[in-house]
């Protein structure tokens, strides 16, 4: 609290060291998600427990589809309000085609670069959203083995909302993306029923991710 | 500097199998950033894509080819491996290995593959 | 399956010339998927542009590539005597994988 009596943020150096991450979310925005409000919303709670800034941790967003868009860089903002603002303002592309390995290569060669922000030494946290099997899952073992050959932590996360719109059998997909979060895959792979039930992992997800740091 | 040569019998007998094996150098293939693949030939033709396969032992084929083809890698050998069965004289080709990563950037010289009785 | 279509089927030019080669896709394909390789007469390919128009190693600056979604463009500014050969485009973004059927660069 500060003379004035006004609650004041004040970071000791220990604890502001043990928040420095890198984050990239990697979101996919294929013509299939559907509501994309649900996927703002998620982001919005994610983000709003974070602690952003240039000397903690710092968040890029990427969206993909048949294209890969980078929709901010890791260090395009520099606190959580800011990057809230931005983070609502993103509208899905959309495309017939989901690249997943594309989305995934891109933001290890491109996001997680010094030019884009990225800081050497800061461990390095995808989050990968995916409703729907990738078209290009042929070049998933190399996109995978280049980001744990650079140490990038994976978080993945299947919709399975257009599966059960349409009583489809998730199993393929599950398996797809169970293969893209690092392991042990069951501390980084996350499946909600549908896109709406998005915010219910948020708090776990939040959780997992800054326990990177412990 | 990385190269790949294809070895295996130049004719083969319809129904049989063809089989080929291409050998690595300068380099080990179970770095993960690679796939190693087989590619065709047709005489005086265009280029086919048979499939390829990851260190870990992922295969990938065309669908066109799958029922037929095996591809396999033995890493301790550093070689991966082509079998092709019930072939016929629409499978006369030219077969290349390659590496591929952002496109096929390393391949072996080719080898004539010629199905006759 | 993704079918590529190259066109001409020969181009006959002089050293010297400018060459523009054409590949079009049956469907929307991501330029980080679509690659050019060069082959001659009893030789394998060689890889000269990833990415659509990233140059390989090694490769001279007079060959560039250009185009999205379902055209794409290899160009060769200035021929060299060493250019004349066939040309394939290729696509890895969905299997399988594809080639064009190639275009012959041939001396006029």
């Known amino acids: 609290v500060s003379p004035t009596f006004q609650v004041v943020n004040s970071i000791a150096p220990v604890q502001e060291c043990s928040t420095q991450l890198d984050i990239v979310i990697v979101l996919d925005g294929s013509n299939s998600i559907y509501p994309w409000d649900s996927v703002t919303a998620f982001l919005n709670d994610l983000l709003e427990r974070m602690d952003i800034g240039p000397k903690q941790t710092q968040v890029g967003i990427v969206q993909y589809g048949e294209n890969v868009t980078h929709e901010f860089n890791l260090n395009k903002y520099s606190s959580t309000e800011e990057v809230l603002v931005a983070a609502k303002k993103i509208g899905r592309r959309g495309g017939l085609q989901t690249m997943t390995a594309l989305g995934i290569d891109t933001a290890r060669k491109e996001a997680f670069t010094e030019a884009r922000g990225a800081r050497r030494g800061v461990k390095k946290v995808m989050v990968i959203v995916t409703d729907g099997e990738s078209h290009d899952n042929h070049r998933l073992k190399k996109v995978i083995q280049d980001c744990e050959d650079e140490n990038i932590q994976r978080f993945s996360i299947a919709i399975l909302g257009s599966y059960n719109r349409g009583n489809l059998s998730t199993e393929k997909f599950v398996e797809e993306i169970k293969s893209i979060a690092s392991e042990p895959t069951e501390k980084h792979f996350f499946n909600v029923s549908d896109e709406l039930a998005l915010v219910t992992i948020v708090k776990t997800l939040g959780e997992r991710i800054f326990a990177l740091e412990a | 500097q990385v190269q790949l040569q294809e070895s295996g019998p130049g004719l083969v007998k319809p129904s049989q199998t063809l089989s080929l094996t291409c050998t690595v150098s300068g380099g080990s293939i179970s770095r993960g950033n690679y796939y190693w693949s087989w590619i065709r030939q047709h005489p005086g033709k265009g280029l086919e894509w048979i499939g390829y396969i990851f260190y870990s032992g992922s295969t990938y084929y065309n669908p066109s080819l799958k029922s037929r083809v095996t591809i396999s890698v033995d890493t301790s050998k550093n070689q991966f491996s082509l079998k092709l069965s019930s072939v016929t004289a629409a499978d006369t080709a030219v077969y290349y290995c390659a590496r591929d990563g952002y496109g096929m950037d390393v391949w072996g010289q080719g080898t004539t593959v010629t199905v006759s009785s | 399956e993704i079918v590529l279509t190259q066109s001409p089927g020969t181009l006959s030019l002089s050293p010297g010339e400018r060459a523009t080669l054409s590949c079009r896709a049956s469907?929307?394909?991501?330029?980080?998927?679509l690659v050019w390789y060069q082959q001659k007469p009893g030789q394998a390919p060689r890889l000269l542009l990833y990415?659509?128009?990233s140059r390989a190693t090694g490769i001279p600056d007079r060959f560039s590539g250009s185009g999205s979604g379902t055209d794409f463009t290899l160009t060769i500014s200035r021929l060299e005597p060493e250019d004349f050969a066939v040309y394939y485009c290729q696509q890895y973004g969905n299997s399988p994988l594809t080639f064009g059927g190639g275009t012959k660069v041939e001396i006029k």
């Open positions: 990415d659509a128009s």
């Open positions: 469907q929307s394909v991501s330029s980080s998927y």
